[in-house]
């Protein structure tokens, strides 16, 4: 503000600072995820908080189980509304195996490429959602190191539903999913009791993602 109380420069509100991010969500779509509606509800709540556009935040989604599918690329949609519609239509692809390392590696190698809409100089964020220990966990060390080398920030979410339903120990699973998260782990790792509880972490997850850019 000038001495004559004229506005000479306007400052964007804080939430507007956090717009330049390329976010790829890596979803476990293996058979044990149930109900799938909880996953799409989680996506809906998370995505509607985002300012999506070619000059703002971009979102891509990868789904994995035994194999990996690009549901949509970072540059596929140019508004939050379009992404919300597309996310609602994502169907669970299933699979008897949970190849988490492959899902993450495919996201790194393919989803975060310029051909699929990644922008040079824009911070890369990966959100990994899974409900069980991976069959390819012996490949995770390399995959995570590769992500580190490319400065990909990783948020990991462990869904404990199938463990709780089967009265199984979650210790090894939680340890694995924590190892996926960027450091400090406590700011990048979440766990929820079951699929329905995914929506309860949306606010905190959203805040932490956008704190990266701020």
């Amino acid at each position: 503000v000038s001495p004559t109380f004229q506005v000479v420069n306007s400052i964007a509100p804080v939430q507007e600072c956090s717009t330049q991010l390329d976010i790829v969500i890596v979803l476990d779509g293996s058979n044990s995820i149930y109900p799938w509606d909880s996953v799409t509800a989680f996506l809906n709540d998370l995505l509607e908080r985002m300012d999506i556009g070619p000059k703002q935040t971009q979102v891509g989604i990868v789904q994995y189980g035994e194999n990996v599918t690009h549901e949509f690329n970072l540059n596929k949609y140019s508004s939050t509304e379009e992404v919300l519609v597309a996310a609602k239509k994502i169907v669970q692809r299933g699979g008897r195996q949970t190849m988490t390392a492959l899902g993450i590696d495919t996201a790194r190698k393919e989803a975060f490429t310029e051909a699929r809409g990644a922008r040079r100089g824009v911070k890369k964020v990966m959100v990994i959602v899974t409900d069980g220990e991976s069959h390819d966990n012996h490949r995770l060390k390399k995959v995570i190191q590769d992500c580190e080398d490319e400065n990909i920030q990783r948020f990991s979410i462990a869904i404990l539903g199938s463990y709780n339903r089967g009265n199984l120990s979650t210790e090894k699973f939680v340890e694995e999913i924590k190892s996926i998260a960027s450091e400090p782990t406590e700011k990048h790792f979440f766990n929820v009791s079951d699929e329905l509880a995914l929506v309860t972490i949306v606010k905190a997850l959203g805040e932490r993602i956008f704190a990266l850019e701020a």
Epitope: R96, M99, T106, R139
Partner: antibody, heavy 117, light 108 residues
């Protein structure tokens, strides 16, 4: 260009421990994009994965050998090693070290180890 | 563990002919985790293909791979004299990493 070279005794007595070292040249073992593997091949037979190690020291072993195998890494020497305890004649084989990224793309030339008294 | 069965055990062909080698898995293998090697007598194996169908550095384009799930194929379009060797498939998606028993391609 990365090269691997196995070294160690070619003859080991039954019940003793087989010890081999793989020296990596032309690149750093600490570069985190690879696992460092040991594979063996019995005379006239196929290939068997023994295990591998990440530069940080995390190890992964073939369950069929796990109780007898130790793989370690020495980043200061750019080497990784294999120890196989309580050997028998069935452990006579060519032992290879290899670099594993997306498949094993660099191999040592292999060293023959005979278990005999 | 995943068992990989290669067939045939031996393939007798002449230079210039097409070789088709099969690798069958006991359970589904992601194609991203399926590789092929070539091994000549007295030598270490050499990586030919990764991701089931991507050629490794320096591998000629007469080598190609295909397949998914439990059935994978290595094809050598026109056999050169240096191609007579043993070929192994390997999966590394599940631990333990496992190799097929090999297919020997010999001169007819």
């Amino acid at each position: 260009q990365v090269q691997l070279q196995e070294s160690g005794p070619g003859l080991v007595k039954p019940s003793q421990t087989l010890s081999l070292t793989c020296t990596v040249s032309g690149g750093s073992i600490s570069r985190g994009n690879y696992y460092w593997s040991w594979i063996r091949q019995h005379p006239g037979k196929g290939l068997e994965w023994i295990g591998y190690i990440f530069y940080s020291g995390s190890t992964y072993y073939n369950p069929s050998l796990k109780s007898r195998v130790t793989i370690s890494v020495d980043t200061s020497k750019n080497q990784f090693s294999l120890k196989l305890s309580s050997v028998t004649a069935a452990d006579t084989a060519v032992y290879y070290c290899a670099r594993d990224g997306y498949g094993m793309d660099v191999w040592g030339q292999g060293t023959t180890v005979t278990v005999s008294s | 563990e995943i068992v990989l069965t290669q067939s045939p055990g031996t393939l007798s062909l002449s230079p210039g002919e097409r070789a088709t080698l099969s690798c069958r898995a006991s359970q589904s293998v992601s194609s991203s985790y399926l590789v092929w090697y070539q091994q000549k007598p007295g030598q270490a194996p050499r990586l030919l293909l990764y991701d089931a169908s991507s050629r490794a550095t320096g591998i000629p384009d007469r080598f190609s791979g295909s397949g998914s799930g439990t059935d994978f194929t290595l094809t050598i379009s026109r056999l050169e004299p240096e191609d007579f060797a043993v070929y192994y498939c390997q999966q590394y998606g599940n631990s333990p990493l496992t190799f097929g028993g090999g297919t020997k391609v010999e001169i007819k």
